[in-house]
Every structure is written in structure tokens, then in C-alpha cells.
Interface confidence: low
């Protein structure tokens, strides 16, 4: 009901954990020397650590990561015609996260 | 087995849909005139549209949004002692998404 909109619920902290994020597959991951092609798909889902910790001296960091190769299509444009090739991109998924102390930044001298 | 890691599965497109994201509650959302306080929690989960579309002329955009008020704690520091107050922040959740045409930028003349 509309009435339920009126109650401001207590805000819950977004805890430090893995969440699904979108990762854009940039062309330079496939081929740094040539930009005359397209990549399909242009983006994929990855698991990444996010959220916040109890104080500003700690940050949500991955404690375990896994590399995951995926196959994409590299669509080269040659004389205005598409040529379909395959390429492999390695994605990084975060498997576990932890609030870890951040090393204090050195003062700029 | 380790051998299974060598197989590159076909990459699946991260479709345009709502996903859980982390939203940082900045102090200026609570009080623009005074910075001498902390906010708890520092971040919350929101639903946001993300993902990619079939071509670069369309973008994943929210078609329906909802404002959601939540109550946070404003911890003011007065004479080095914390004073706990309540404040309300309005979060915006995306409820539905669509790949929408991006208006072409006019050429710079």
C-alpha cells in the first residue's frame, strides 16, 4: 500500500561481500595493436567484493580470487565486411572478501 | 579438476537489468553546512540498472524508479563527545530497465 512508503526503515549497512557486477570487455584486452574490430559480448558479469567496513581505516578487499577464461567473438572489419574470429579473455572473480586494514598513505613531501 | 579450468566457456552478455549495488551515504546528503559529524551506516544497498545492450547507440537506462527513505544515524562530535541523532536519506532504487536509444550528440561546429 502507499502507506508503507511513509515509513523510513533503519538503513542497513551494505556489508563487505561479493556482488555481481558488470565488466566491460574492452578491445585492448583482445588486441592492443588493432582497433578495427568489435567484441561480442561487450560486457559480462563478474563477482566482485563491495560494501563498507566499520571504519575508514579498513577497506573491503578480496581474500580469494579465481581466474575464469571465457570465449568472445572478435568481429574484424575487412573491406567493410565482417570476419568472425574467436578470442579468449580471462576474467577475475572474487570468491571471498574481508575488511582489511589499509596501509597509511605516505605524506606528500 | 584443474583440467576443467582450461576450457573457455562462451562469454554470456551481462543483460540490461537491475542489480544490487553499493551506495555511499555522503555527509553532504545529511547536512551541507557542517562536516563535523559521522554517518552510520556509511553505505547501503540499492537496486540499479546495469548491463549492456546490442549496440553502442543504446544504453541500459531505468524506466521506473522508486524513492525509498531510510533512517541513518548522524553522530555529531561536540566537545570531542558523540551526540547521536537521526536523519532520513532518500535512496533511489531502479525497478525496471530498458535498452534505450541515446540521443546522438550534435557535431561541434
Amino acid at each position: 500500500s502507499l502507506g508503507s512508503l511513509t515509513v523510513a526503515e533503519p538503513a542497513m549497512i551494505a556489508e563487505c561481500k561479493t556482488r555481481t557486477e558488470v565488466f566491460e570487455i574492452s578491445r585492448r584486452l583482445i588486441d592492443r595493436t588493432n582497433a578495427n574490430f568489435l567484441v561480442w559480448p561487450p560486457c559480462v558479469e563478474v563477482q566482485r567484493c563491495s560494501g563498507c567496513c566499520n571504519n575508514r581505516n579498513v577497506q573491503c578487499r578480496p581474500t580469494q580470487v579465481q581466474l575464469r577464461p571465457v570465449q568472445v567473438r572478435k568481429i574484424e572489419i575487412v573491406r567493410k565486411k565482417p570476419i568472425f574470429k574467436k578470442a579468449t579473455v580471462t576474467l577475475e572473480d572474487h570468491l571471498a572478501c574481508k575488511c582489511e586494514t589499509v596501509a597509511a598513505a605516505r605524506p606528500v613531501t | 579438476s584443474l583440467g576443467s579450468l582450461t576450457v573457455a566457456e562462451p562469454a554470456m552478455i551481462a543483460e540490461c537489468k537491475t542489480r544490487t549495488e553499493v551506495f555511499e551515504i555522503s555527509r553532504r546528503l545529511i547536512d551541507r553546512t557542517n562536516a563535523n559529524f559521522l554517518v552510520w551506516p556509511p553505505c547501503v544497498e540499492v537496486q540499479r540498472c546495469s548491463g549492456c545492450c546490442n549496440n553502442r547507440n543504446v544504453q541500459c537506462r531505468p524506466t521506473q524508479v522508486q524513492l525509498r527513505p531510510v533512517q541513518v544515524r548522524k553522530i555529531e562530535i561536540v566537545r570531542k563527545k558523540p551526540i547521536f541523532k537521526k536523519a532520513t536519506v532518500t535512496l533511489e532504487d531502479h525497478l525496471a530497465c530498458k535498452c534505450e536509444t541515446v540521443a546522438a550528440a550534435r557535431p561541434v561546429t
Epitope: 512508503l5 | 546528503l29 551541507r32 537506462r61 524508479v65 524513492l67 527513505p69 532518500t90
Partner: antibody
């Protein structure tokens, strides 16, 4: 000093199109949500549309949804309102307004407005 | 949509008078209520946000109160420059809506 200057208004026939611009200065444009609000002659204020700081989120009044498009170019400090399929009831002074913090739907600063007249 | 109803639609008052304008929301909007002042031919100016917070630079004779559905704008001692039209606006949920306005005229 915050300054918002609208342009692009004028006389247009029903069914026609106009593109309004709002040039912003005196504040960090890319950090603020922006809105369009209109006022028909002798009438009250009516919210038209709001766009987020990065341009990724937009919201529209039902009366303009599907006909008007709000957009922004943060590199030019400019807000736009593309108005299509204009109707006589769209006749109003259109003002852009700076909409406060990231989730503030209020209007801190306003431009003087630009008059849009829809008539045959 | 949330309807905002302002009363009165107009009033006549003298310099020095205490003026009260009310705004009622069709459903609870917590404290998401803002007040604006508009003079003829000029852009509106934000006076009060979040029901009772005075916008920077606004004279302290202006005050706001209320929460839920009923809100009040009070001018403690009307000054010549205060003759204008006043609008309330809810910023609780889109579509954002304004009250119909209250015109404060010289008696």
C-alpha cells in the same frame, strides 16, 4: 555565484519540436542533479523532469513522458530538454534548476526561464 | 501521485503582521517538504527545505514546521519585500508536485 541561463524557447506549431538549453556556471555542474520546471502563464509551478549528476538516471512527469527527453553534457556545463510532439498545453516558461545533493529532489537555484509558446 | 493543497490561495496582510500559510499532502511525506517564494517576473527562491530547515541567506522571520501530511510556513513579521506568491513542494517521491500557491498581497 550560481548562474543558470536558459535558451531555445520560441513559437512553435502543435506537433513541432524545440530543444531548450541551460548553461550553468558558478558551481561544479557535474556534481549536481538538475531539473526542468515549467510555469504556464498565470499558473503555478509544474515539475517536468530531473536528471542525475552523471546523466544515468532520468525521471519525467506523466504529462511529458515519451515526448520530452532530458540530457546533459557535463563537459559543456549544459543541460538540455528535447521537446517533441508539442501541444498547446505545453505553453509555459521553462526554467532549469539545480537540484541539490545526490538524492535531493528540491530546487536550490533557478534560471530566469525561457518562454515556449505552442500555437497554430 | 501525491497532491499538495495550499491554503489560503490568497491573503491580504499589513507590514508587521504574522502570516501563516498551510500545505497539506494527500499522503504522508515525512519531512520532505520545501517552500519557495516567487515575485512577479522572477525565478522562484528556495526558503525552507526538509519542512523546517532555513535555506542559507533567508531571513530568520521565515520558519517552517510540520511532518507527515500537514505543514506550515510562518512569516513572523511581514516585511515589504515579502509580498509575493509562496509555493510548497514535496520531494518525497516522483512525480514531484507543487501546491497551487498562496499570493500574499498588501492590505
Amino acid at each position: 555565484e550560481v548562474q543558470l541561463v536558459e535558451s531555445g524557447g520560441g513559437l512553435v506549431q502543435p506537433g513541432g519540436s524545440l530543444r531548450l538549453s541551460c548553461a550553468a556556471s558558478g558551481f561544479t555542474f557535474s556534481s549536481y542533479w538538475m531539473s526542468w520546471v515549467r510555469q504556464a502563464p498565470g499558473k503555478g509551478l509544474e515539475w517536468v523532469s530531473t536528471i542525475s549528476d552523471g546523466g544515468g538516471t532520468t525521471s519525467y512527469a506523466d504529462s511529458v513522458k515519451g515526448r520530452f527527453t532530458i540530457s546533459r553534457d557535463n563537459s559543456k556545463n549544459t543541460l538540455y530538454l528535447q521537446m517533441n510532439s508539442l501541444r498547446a498545453e505545453d505553453t509555459a516558461v521553462y526554467s532549469c534548476a539545480e537540484s541539490g545533493g545526490a538524492t535531493d529532489y528540491l530546487f536550490d537555484y533557478w534560471g530566469q526561464g525561457t518562454l515556449v509558446t505552442v500555437s497554430s | 501521485d501525491i497532491q499538495m493543497t495550499q491554503s489560503p490561495s490568497s491573503l491580504s496582510a499589513s507590514v508587521g503582521d504574522r502570516v501563516t500559510i498551510t500545505c497539506r499532502a494527500s499522503q504522508s511525506i515525512s519531512s520532505y517538504l520545501n517552500w519557495y517564494q516567487q515575485k512577479p517576473g522572477k525565478a522562484p527562491k528556495l526558503l525552507i527545505y526538509a519542512a523546517s530547515s532555513l535555506q542559507s541567506g533567508v531571513p530568520s522571520r521565515f520558519s517552517g514546521s510540520g511532518s507527515g501530511t500537514d505543514f506550515t510556513l510562518t512569516i513572523s513579521s511581514l516585511q515589504p519585500e515579502d509580498f509575493a506568491t509562496y509555493y510548497c513542494q514535496q520531494s518525497y517521491i516522483t512525480p514531484l508536485t507543487f501546491g497551487g500557491g498562496t499570493k500574499v498581497e498588501i492590505k
